[in-house]
Interface confidence: medium
């Protein structure tokens, strides 16, 4: 898939919240359109619109426990996984085999993490060790990002390790499932 690799642990532990700059508020003016739940209005014609906020992401709510070594959070945290395409349906069918047809010069709209939030969690450790408090960075919302067919993985590197899934070594298209997913269960997932 060509995603950047990242450390295979449960989440990114943040020493200090202030170390992470706020992502740019690119779609702040039309955030409600940027959600699959809200069924964002499709454009009049594919790729004629310049307002990416008209495309909505598929935001999957997951819950998981935060782990740090052998320690695990007392309660699960809730975050989003940003997944797949978020533009109009493809204009061309797949080629035979695993390859994809690319629109000759058309953009590819991918769903990637937009805003993050910090949450303090209490980590419980085995062997009677004292509980530890940590701040974790969680995906709070997703957005569409317009990529061209020639964009490579560097296009996703601005969005932190949650923005891309582990390497799979196939298909040249960047995939942005986004946040590392989660465990337990979301009480109000929908």
């Amino acid at each position: 898939q060509g995603w950047q690799a990242f450390k295979n642990d449960a989440t990114e532990i943040i020493p200090e919240l202030g170390e992470y700059p706020e992502p740019p508020p690119e779609l702040e003016n039309n955030k409600t359109m940027n959600r699959a739940e809200n069924g964002g209005r499709p454009p009049h014609h594919p790729f004629e619109t310049k307002d990416v906020s008209e495309y909505s992401c598929r935001e999957l709510h997951f819950t998981r426990y935060v782990t740090d070594g052998q320690c695990r959070s007392a309660k699960p945290v809730t975050e989003l996984v940003c997944s797949g395409q978020c533009g109009p349906a493809r204009l061309l069918p797949n080629a035979i085999g695993r390859g994809k047809w690319w629109r000759p010069s058309g953009p590819d709209f991918r769903c990637i993490p937009d805003r993050y939030r910090a949450q303090r969690v209490q980590l419980l450790c085995p062997g009677g060790a004292a509980p530890r408090a940590r701040k974790v960075r969680l995906v709070a919302s997703c957005k569409c990002k317009r990529l061209t067919r020639f964009h490579n993985q560097s296009e996703l590197k601005d969005f932190g390790p949650e923005a891309a899934r582990p390497q799979k070594g196939r298909k040249p298209r960047p995939r942005a499932r986004g946040a590392k997913a989660n465990q337990a269960e979301l009480e109000n997932a929908y």
């Epitope: 819950t63 109009p88 069918p93 590392k180 997913a181 929908y190």
Partner: antibody
Framework: QVQLVQSGAEVKKPGSSVKVSCKAS????????LNWVRQAPGQGLEWMGT????????TYSQKFKGRVTITADKSTSTAYMELSSLRSEDTAVYYC???????????WGQGTTVTVSS | DIQMTQSPSSLSASVGDRVTITCSAS??????LNWYQQKPGKAPKLLIY???SLHSGVPSRFSGSGSGTDFTLTISSLQPEDFATYYC?????????FGGGTKVEIK
């Protein structure tokens, strides 16, 4: 090639639990969501829940919440679906299905028939 | 939950016929719609994803269209192996939901 191989048929008593396994091969197990879908005799398809084995994230259909538990064993690339407090209406074929990047279930297990009968 | 309604629930057709199956969502789902084919005693098979993208190995006689709430699966020229039940599925919002199915039978 990608394969999802499920455990064999089960006959269970009402009130008991069943645990169905789904062994994945031919792809990196932790890279994909794995869903569970069931189909009662002569009926349509019903989504139960999904797991992201990369770190065991789960989400379930409200209908089964509290009765279903989906887990994954990364060391054996196997996902499990446990359904408790079985009743006769849980008699169905249970499928596991891999989810690709745009939400499509591109590979399915062969199905496991669970019969709940007293 | 988003309800997915397929029509017709069954249809009879002959080899070579053009067959159209519709799927209606109870609320807008943009293009987050997949189509599956299922034969008796077998697991479903993916045909179309993201409304109109053909899955690998699926013949080009299958096509999908639509957006928002109304979607269509078309088989341009029905073949003997196409007699089966077809399901639509939305994945815009949890829980993922399927249509009730359309059984395509031999006339």
């Amino acid at each position: 090639q990608v394969q999802l191989v499920q455990s064999g048929a089960e006959v269970k008593k009402p009130g008991s639990s069943v645990k169905v396994s789904c062994k994945a091969s031919g792809y990196t197990f932790t890279d994909y969501f794995l869903n569970w879908v069931r189909q009662a005799p002569g009926q349509g398809l019903e989504w139960m829940g999904t797991i992201y084995p990369y770190h065991d994230g789960t989400t379930y259909s409200q209908k089964f919440k509290g009765r279903v538990t989906i887990t994954a064993d990364k060391s054996t690339s196997t996902a499990y679906m446990e359904l408790s407090s079985l009743r006769s209406e849980d008699t169905a074929v249970y499928y596991c299905a891999r989810e690709e990047e745009d939400g499509q279930f591109d590979y399915w297990g062969q199905g496991t028939t669970v019969t709940v009968s007293s | 939950d988003i309800q997915m309604t397929q029509s017709p629930s069954s249809l009879s057709a002959s080899v070579g016929d053009r067959v159209t199956i519709t799927c209606s969502a109870s609320q807008g789902i943009q293009w987050y719609l997949n189509w599956y084919q299922q034969k008796p005693g077998k697991a479903p098979k993916l045909l179309i994803y993201y409304t109109s993208s053909l899955h690998s190995g699926v013949p080009s006689r299958f096509s999908g269209s639509g957006s928002g709430t109304d979607f269509t699966l078309t088989i341009s020229s029905l073949q003997p192996e196409d007699f089966a039940t077809y399901y639509c599925q939305q994945h815009s919002k949890l829980p993922r939901t399927f249509g009730g199915g359309t059984k395509v039978e031999i006339k």
